[in-house]
Interface confidence: low
């Protein structure tokens, strides 16, 4: 017995984080010779029977979850993983700082603090140069970032966003960039650690204190690395899980 039609991939170009009024293209990619594509916005009646959706100017109403599938003959493929399209610049930018400072010795520890004047309960941190994150919504509820040994791979420019779990696809503008400098090392690891983090991070309602920890576990499709945080849930042994399903993840 041959298997089902394989699921297509769905990606946002140039990024799934889209500033308001900026363009983005959603592209559904299946095998050659597809008869029909269907690209839809979940939790709405919007869909189109085309592989590419060009959005010339991002709007709040267009943020959300998207999924696609394709048809060959009478058969429909399995659905793509969900893509979550985020509108940024909806709220004022938070501030990003490093504790004890933005210069850290190799092997030392550093904590990045993302702070907002709003009562937001969610924060996202990402490193410049990585592809924009393709996130899984459950991760808005994961505040699990262990202290790790900093390496040269952690050097770079960081920004953070803040937003509310009530509107997880509407983010603030990015913070001003923070340059993290790792001193006393000359070797850059060829790859990052892959062990998932354990739940240790805690912070107050409007302040996210994140120990820098990049693993392939945090929301990623290719080589992107991004981390998010939210208040710790002590009754959840595995760390908080998202309250609704939207895979696009």
């Amino acid at each position: 017995q041959s298997g089902p039609l394989p699921k297509p991939s769905l990606q946002a170009l140039p990024s799934s984080l889209v500033p308001l009024e900026k363009p983005v293209t959603l592209r559904c990619q299946g095998p050659p010779g597809v008869d029909l594509y269907r690209l839809e916005k979940l939790s709405s009646s919007r869909y189109q029977d085309q592989a590419v959706l060009f959005i010339p100017a991002m709007k709040r109403s267009l943020a959300g979850r998207y999924r696609c599938s394709y048809q060959n003959g009478s058969l429909w493929s399995l659905p793509s993983d969900q893509l979550e399209l985020v509108a940024t610049g909806v709220f004022a930018k938070p501030s990003l700082s490093a504790q004890p400072g933005p210069a850290v010795s190799s092997g030392g520890d550093v904590t990045l603090q993302c702070q907002t004047r709003y009562g937001f309960d969610q924060f996202a941190l990402y490193k410049e140069g990585d592809p924009a994150p393709y996130k899984n919504p459950e991760r808005w509820y994961r505040a699990s970032f262990p202290i790790i040994t900093v390496t040269a791979a952690h050097s770079g420019t960081y920004r953070c966003y803040s937003f509310s779990s009530r509107d997880p696809y509407l983010w603030s503008a990015p913070s001003d960039p923070l340059e993290l400098v790792v001193t006393g090392t000359s070797v850059t690891p060829s790859r990052l650690p892959t062990e998932p983090p354990s739940p240790v991070a805690e912070f107050s309602e409007a302040t996210a204190e994140l120990t820098v920890s990049f693993t392939n576990e945090v929301f990623t499709t290719e080589t992107s690395r991004s981390i998010t945080a939210s208040p710790k849930e002590s009754d959840s042994p595995a760390g908080p899980a998202r309250q609704y399903y939207t895979k696009g993840n």
Epitope: G3, P4, K7, E40, L42, S43, S69, W76, L78, P79, D81, Y134, N136, E138, R139, P196, N216, E217, F219, T220, T221, A238, A241, Y244, Y245, T246, K247, N249
Partner: antibody, heavy 114, light 106 residues
């Protein structure tokens, strides 16, 4: 050929933890997700949770406080851990591939009893 | 969470006959429904996904239809090997099974 095989302890004492391993072959865990489903005696199927190809997880809301799903891509294994077991957790536990669960294991029977 | 109400919970039919099972979702699931056959001692088998797409190797006497909140699954030309319990599954938002329908042959 796609295959999934569950392995578990068989018997677990109340209030203890349950750990089950799903070993897969014929597909990559970096691309496909794996679900966990159970069936209590003489009852229907119940979805427990899922781990996606990129490592993210989804859990049934009533179980998420005591459920954890993880995986080891290099060993082609997915792990289910459930804490604070009661006799209501007695069931046959299945792992199944991705959405909408096109391939299933045969299941492993778990009895919660003292 | 989305609830799936499956009916009937059991039914009996004759060889060569036709049976229909229905599932009603508590909200619009946008055709993201699958149907499974489950026999004792085995893992469930996926028959249909996305409302009406038959899995490769599944006989065409199995069919599915529906939209919005209401979906149905039918077996025509019933065969003795069709004795099993059948489940619907929504996968639009989390995953939820229907309660199951036990099919017996008269």
């Amino acid at each position: 050929q796609v295959q999934l095989q569950e392995s578990g302890p068989g018997l677990v004492a109340p209030s203890q933890s349950l750990s089950i391993t799903c070993t897969v072959s014929g597909f990559s865990l970096t691309y496909y997700g794996v679900n966990w489903v159970r069936q209590p005696p003489s009852r229907g199927l119940e979805w427990l949770g899922m781990i996606w190809g990129d490592g993210s997880t989804d859990y049934q809301s009533t179980l998420k406080s005591r459920l954890s799903i993880s995986k080891d891509n290099s060993k082609s294994q997915v792990f289910l851990k459930m804490n604070s077991l009661t006799t209501d957790d007695t069931a046959r536990y299945y792992c199944a591939r991705d959405l909408p669960m096109d391939y299933w294991g045969q299941g492993t029977s778990v009895t919660v009893s003292s | 969470d989305i609830q799936m109400t499956q009916s009937p919970s059991s039914l009996s039919a004759s060889v060569g006959g036709r049976v229909t099972i229905t599932c009603k979702a508590s909200q619009d699931i946008n055709k993201y429904i699958a149907w499974y056959q489950h026999k004792p001692g085995k893992g469930p088998s996926l028959l249909i996904h996305y409302t009406s797409t038959l899995q490769p190797g599944v006989p065409s006497r199995f069919s599915g239809s529906g939209s919005g909140r209401d979906y149905s699954f039918s077996i025509s030309n019933l065969q003795p090997e069709d004795i099993a319990t059948y489940y619907c599954l929504q996968y639009a938002n989390l995953l939820t099974f229907g309660g199951g329908t036990k099919l017996e042959i008269k």
